[in-house]
Interface confidence: medium
């Protein structure tokens, strides 16, 4: 059974992930971002189900495409380089889901824009955090 300290650690990691995802969303939604229209043409795979930490496997597989889109933006709205930003997210995701997970991600039939994708995972983080508090 999870201890109170491990639950707290998980909660902090989820909050960190949530902030990183929100930072990306805020950066690309900035009204001064001239490349938003082009960024919205990129398609992302959405998880069929995202209710448990193991489902973060679906986010992990989409981190490389996410970084590619952020490289396209070359936005001054981010304090970190895309590589560093996504690398930070990757570290958190690996710790949360476990690096040796055998879960096989299933994706929904419909793809999504980067905004929809980020909102989905932001909602996921908020949902899990609410169950821990």
């Amino acid at each position: 059974a999870p201890t109170s300290s491990s639950t707290k650690k998980t909660q902090l990691q989820l909050e960190h992930l949530l902030l990183d995802l929100q930072m990306i969303l805020n950066g690309i939604n900035n009204y001064k971002n001239p490349k938003l229209t082009r960024m919205l043409t990129f398609k992302f795979y959405m998880p069929k189900k995202a209710t448990e930490l193991k489902h973060l496997q679906c986010l992990e597989e989409e981190l490389k495409p996410l970084e590619e889109v952020l490289n396209l933006a070359q936005s001054k709205n981010f304090h970190l380089r895309p590589r560093d930003l996504i690398s930070n997210i990757n570290v958190i995701v690996l710790e949360l889901k476990g690096s040796e997970t055998t879960f096989m991600c299933e994706y929904a039939d419909e793809t999504a824009t980067i905004v929809e994708f980020l909102n989905r995972w932001i909602t996921f983080c908020q949902s899990i955090i609410s169950t821990l508090t």
């Epitope: 795979y45 496997q57 992990e60 597989e61 989409e62 981190l63 490389k64 495409p65 970084e67 590619e68 490289n71 380089r81 895309p82 590589r83 560093d84 996504i86 690398s87 990757n90 690996l94 690096s99 040796e100 997970t101 055998t102 096989m104 991600c105 299933e106 994706y107």
Partner: antibody, heavy 120, light 112 residues
Framework: EVQLLESGGGLAQPGGSLRLSCAGS????????MSWVRQAPGKGLEWVSG????????YYADSVKGRFTVSRDNSRNTVYLQMNSLRAEDTAVYYC?????????????WGQGTLVTVSS | QSALTQPPSVSGAPGQRVTISCTGS?????????VHWYQQVPGTVPKLLID???NRPSGVPDRFSGSKSGTSASLAITGLQAEDEADYYC????????????FGRGTKLTVL
């Protein structure tokens, strides 16, 4: 022990096709991204193509884009490289390699390689 | 033309220290991507020597070490031995390239 076994190499004519297979064992196959790396005779290593654990995302080097297709069947623990419109410059040993993770990992396991020769 | 530049060859006497450089640019090593090193002994399959976090797989002696600074990386081999004679490749990622994976052209190490 991680094992990767390639097959399907051989002689093909320019413009012809070949399909390479790579069977993986000793690890949870679907949890790993896989790539194909080739080495022309007496030359260095060249990354060819990659595919994520689910198979939803595929990546290609410019030199093979539109001609090669990577795919995988996780129920059979196998990854494939369909090579069409082959050229003489595609002649090489093709290695199947396992990535350490989905996100910009390193190639931690290599197969023995299969030789593809494109010649008329 | 590879996005990562390595010297074609280096050499050293047994017991010496040699370094192999891997020079990139702001779109690969300089962008923060890790650099990985592989060793290929003549007639054999390449094998991972050092990963981007500086870790060595089991069986790789601690005589091998990697470092990175700015847009360059280097592999250092101390206490050179005859069995170290091989080709060495650096590998990273480049967001300007399709697929983004990139290898250096390789460096032939000769033990004198």
């Amino acid at each position: 022990e991680v094992q990767l076994l390639e097959s399907g190499g051989g002689l093909a004519q320019p413009g012809g096709s070949l399909r390479l297979s790579c069977a993986g064992s000793g690890f949870t196959f679907s949890s790993y991204a896989m790539s194909w790396v080739r080495q022309a005779p007496g030359k260095g290593l060249e990354w060819v193509s990659g595919i994520t654990g689910t198979g939803y995302r595929t990546y290609y080097a410019d030199s093979v884009k539109g001609r090669f297709t990577v795919s995988r069947d996780n129920s059979r623990n196998t990854v494939y490289l369909q090579m069409n419109s082959l050229r003489a410059e595609d002649t090489a040993v093709y290695y199947c390699v396992r990535e350490s993770g989905h996100y910009y990992g390193w190639f931690d396991s290599w197969g023995q390689g299969t030789l593809v020769t494109v010649s008329s | 033309q590879s996005a990562l530049t390595q010297p074609p060859s280096v050499s050293g006497a047994p017991g010496q220290r040699v370094t192999i450089s891997c020079t990139g640019s702001s779109s690969n090593i300089g962008a923060g991507y890790n650099v990985h090193w592989y060793q290929q002994v003549p007639g054999t399959v390449p094998k991972l020597l050092i990963d981007g976090k500086g870790n060595r797989p089991s069986g790789v002696p601690d005589r091998f070490s990697g470092s990175k600074s700015g847009t360059s990386a280097s592999l250092a081999i101390t206490g050179l031995q005859a069995e170290d004679e091989a080709d060495y490749y650096c590998q990273s990622y480049d967001y300007m390239l399709s697929g983004s994976v990139v290898f250096g052209r390789g460096t032939k190490l000769t033990v004198l």
